[in-house]
Interface confidence: low
């Protein structure tokens, strides 16, 4: 089999007879060159899915509950291509599985205990599988068989295809639970029609369901969304209130070697010659011999999964977690209403020593998860395998995209009701050597520049969005000479400067020593012409409070500041010329996570933090020798952000825009993965 | 950052032929889609000739095909564009594009919109 060639698995003689048809059709219009097609034969798509993770075919669309077998060791498959839906300008690749209600009902998700409930049908993923996955570990025990456990939990359903013999209750609103558009209450709509006439409390349906069903906004506004955080919203807010989302329908290739690039290719052409509307001898989401063969034939075309999502990332963690709890049938043993341990993020070998050490002081509150990158960790949290970390504004955006929610913010002033008054930010600056006096924000083009890392904020995001805003591109590297900008590629010239050894050169954490408030500083010292850095970050390393060797000798009067009309001033009037205020760092975790993280951490730092006097002898959490390791080293307490809590309202409008602007420069692999799930 | 340099355009009579050049710099080349749109006086854009870069497919417009050919040298970079039997309605400025990440998620591979980094533009006039 050439290089170039997609081996597509079929599961029935049907889908067999239609690959074989896809083949014949693509060689007619593809070049000999060109990716070209070969049909695999398998009983189910489990067959499929082990045969992909064996090579002995390459690719097969499956709709999520599938992905997730796929993903599972020993398969470890992932989502490469999407079917959409709808139109090309507003393609649809995910539908929301939500919770509706009547607007008067008054009660809340975790209030569905005792209510009665109408479902698409059993075993069904929005009406049945996502709902109760997420109530799985509120349901009775014993929760085997789940239909009693569903059953003793409700006090009545409407669950079609249940068997009403043995579980009457799961019947009671539809009797009989017939498994066909026969049972009014059957399917999207049926479950619906079911809340709709009083029946049932609460209906499991998919977004769409209600406008499909209900064309005036006037009827429409009777109704609202169950959120998972015990709130509710209009029904057309479901992208921020859903039960979980779900993508539709997906193509998916091993995970090494699995030839992405190739299947997207192929499918792209294929879409432009036999897709909706293009020809009328082949046609690729058409199954004239059975239905949504290969394909659904309700997909209008394809979309490229960006490559950094995998499969937990696509799939979302609230599908992940109903889907787990499902099959796993596992639950924690601790009572609900109290707080598991905190998962906390941390960067790299330095980060971890001292997340360890807080592990062992806060006596099982923490516990610590390590990732390499930032945005490993934005990752791990999005996906539960880790619970919170602490960001800068630039990460906090990221964290944002991804769905993530900040619960505090740094402060770095000190006040008596330091927990309660969240600041106004700190000021992004410009610093250079006194020395070279002819130097402005005006002339920078071709010096040595110094930046903590790439997307963060007083390093990045504000001055390289200024930069932007001035040279109309994004060739960053070409305007300086060279520098250290850690996170850059590794044959930039803003990695030139960078002092890592081997591979830590230039990687966005602590193992590059140019890494950071301080080692964007210490690049600034030894090596560079500007540094762009926080306000603080200079008396904080001069007149020997940083004891470092490089820097045990600084005096704060030799830097001083660039200003943005050309001018300079002295390192301490930055309130009158820094390059722009940018938001404190803020804790970040899961929307699910918020109440226990704020809550732990409030208890943590009242145990550790800025009232330990003595950090020889004592855990101290907000010290780390000016590393600025978990947090910044400056932090004097974590803050309520009160109405702040989305990361829209934290960051502020105008951050948002300035970031949103400088977008188009991102090598965020994972900002680009966040918006192909939330455009 | 990325960047695009193209050349080749130029003066030729009706029935001639040109060759037109764009070499891409700054990001890693192949497994993109690259390739070339023209825009004639007073007209929109329009997809002329795109191919997936790194030994991939080639597409064209219906107005082009037979006459031009798209072809690529992984070595240098560089996507070329041979223009024969040259008409007067090939007149226009030829932009060298290129569709980097999300871009590609349009399902068009002629679409415009698809393409995020464009080059300067050349000028291409076809006149006795």
């Known amino acids: 089999v050439p290089d170039k060639t997609v081996r597509w698995c079929a599961v029935s003689e049907h889908e067999a007879t239609k690959c074989q048809s896809f083949r014949d059709h693509m060689k007619s219009v593809i070049p000999s060159d060109g990716p070209s097609v070969a049909c695999v034969k398998k009983a189910s798509y489990l067959d499929c899915i082990r045969a992909i993770a064996a090579n002995e075919a390459d690719a097969v669309t499956l709709d999520a509950g599938l992905v997730y077998d796929a993903y599972l060791a020993p398969n470890n498959l992932k989502p490469v291509v999407a079917e959409f839906y709808g139109s090309k300008e507003d393609p649809q690749t995910f539908y929301y599985a939500v919770a509706v209600v009547k607007k008067d009902s008054g009660f809340q998700m975790n209030q569905l205990r005792g209510k009665k409930s109408c479902h698409t049908g059993l075993g069904r993923s929005a009406g049945w599988n996502i709902p109760i996955g997420l109530l799985y570990c509120d349901l009775p025990e014993p929760r085997k068989p789940l239909e009693k456990a569903v059953a003793n939990f409700f006090s009545g359903s409407c669950a079609p295809c249940a068997d009403g013999t043995d579980f009457p209750q799961l019947c009671q609103l539809c009797p009989g639970c017939g498994c066909s558009t026969l049972n009014q209450y059957f399917g999207y709509s049926g479950a619906f029609k079911c809340l709709k006439d009083g029946a049932g409390d609460v209906a499991f349906v998919k977004h769409s369901t209600i406008f499909e069903n209900l064309a005036n906004k006037a009827d429409r506004d009777q109704y609202e969304l169950l959120c998972l955080d015990n709130t509710r919203k209009p029904v057309d807010e479901y992208k921020d209130c859903h039960l979980a989302q779900v993508p539709s329908h997906t193509v998916v290739a091993r995970s090494m070697g699995g030839k992405e690039d190739l299947i997207w290719e192929l499918l792209n052409q294929a879409q432009e010659h036999f897709g909706k509307d293009k020809s009328k001898e082949f046609q690729l989401f058409s199954s004239p011999h059975g239905k949504d063969l290969l394909f659904k034939d309700s997909a209008h075309g394809f979309l490229k999964v960006p490559p950094r999502m995998d499969a937990k990332m696509y799939l979302g963690y609230e599908y992940v977690t109903a889907i787990r709890n499902l099959r796993e049938g596992t639950c924690p043993e601790a009572p609900t209403d109290e707080c598991k341990p905190v998962k906390w993020c941390a960067l790299s070998h330095h980060e971890r020593l001292k997340c360890d050490e807080w592990s062992v002081n806060s006596v099982g509150k923490i516990e610590c998860v390590s990732a390499e990158t930032t945005e490993d960790c934005i990752a791990k949290i999005m996906n539960g395998e880790a619970d919170a970390m602490s960001l800068d504004g630039g990460f906090v955006y990221i964290a944002g995209k991804c769905g993530l929610v900040p619960v505090l913010a740094e402060n770095y002033n000190k006040s008596d009701n330091c927990e309660d008054t969240p600041e106004a930010g700190y000021f992004a600056i410009a610093v250079v050597k006194k020395s070279a006096s002819d130097l402005t924000w005006d002339n920078l083009k071709g010096k040595k520049s110094c930046h903590t890392a790439v997307g963060r904020t007083a390093g990045w995001n504000i001055p390289m969005g200024l930069l932007y805003n001035k040279i109309n591109h994004c060739r960053f590297d070409e305007f300086f000479s060279e520098g250290c900008a850690p996170g850059s590629k590794k044959d930039s010239s803003l990695c030139k400067l960078c002092m890592g050894s081997g591979l830590n050169l230039c990687e966005p954490n602590n193992k590059e020593g140019y890494y950071g408030y301080t080692g964007a500083f210490r690049c600034l010292v030894e090596k560079g012409d500007v540094a762009f850095v926080k306000h603080q970050t200079v008396p904080q390393n001069t007149g020997g409070k940083n004891p470092d060797p490089w820097a045990k000798n600084l005096n704060e009067k030799d830097y001083e500041l660039l200003c943005l009309d050309g001018t300079r001033k002295p390192v301490e009037e930055y309130a009158n010329c820094h390059l722009a205020r940018a938001p404190n760092h803020a804790v970040v975790t899961r929307k699910d996570k918020e109440a226990c993280v704020h809550k732990i951490l409030r208890q943590q730092q009242h145990l550790f933090g800025s009232n330990v006097t003595d950090c020889s002898g004592n855990f101290c959490l907000f010290r780390s020798e000016t590393k600025d390791l978990l947090f910044r080293d400056d932090t004097v307490c974590l803050a309520k952000l009160h109405d702040r809590n989305t990361y829209e309202k934290y960051l502020g409008e105008e951050y948002v825009k300035a970031v949103g602007n400088l977008r188009k420069c991102s090598t965020s692999s994972l900002l680009e993965a966040c918006t192909f799930r939330r455009p | 950052e990325v960047q695009l340099v193209e050349s080749g355009g130029g003066l030729v009579q009706p029935g001639g032929s040109l060759r037109l050049s764009c070499a891409a710099s700054?990001?890693?080349?192949?497994?993109?889609?690259m390739g070339w749109f023209r825009q004639a006086p007073g007209k929109g854009l329009e997809g002329v000739a795109v191919?997936?870069?790194?030994?991939?497919?080639?597409y064209y417009a219906d107005s082009v095909k037979g006459r031009f050919t798209i072809s690529e040298d992984n070595s240098k970079n560089t996507v070329y564009l041979q223009m024969n039997s040259l008409r007067a309605e090939d007149t226009a400025v030829y932009y060298c594009?290129?569709?980097?990440?999300?871009?590609?998620?349009?399902?068009?591979?002629?679409?415009?919109?698809?393409?995020?980094?464009w080059g300067q533009g050349t000028l291409v006039t076809v006149s006795s």
């Open positions: 700054g990001h890693a080349y192949g497994g993109n889609y």
């Open positions: 191919l997936y870069t790194g030994g991939g497919s080639t």
């Open positions: 594009a290129l569709a980097l990440g999300s871009a590609r998620w349009y399902t068009s591979s002629l679409d415009a919109r698809a393409y995020n980094i």
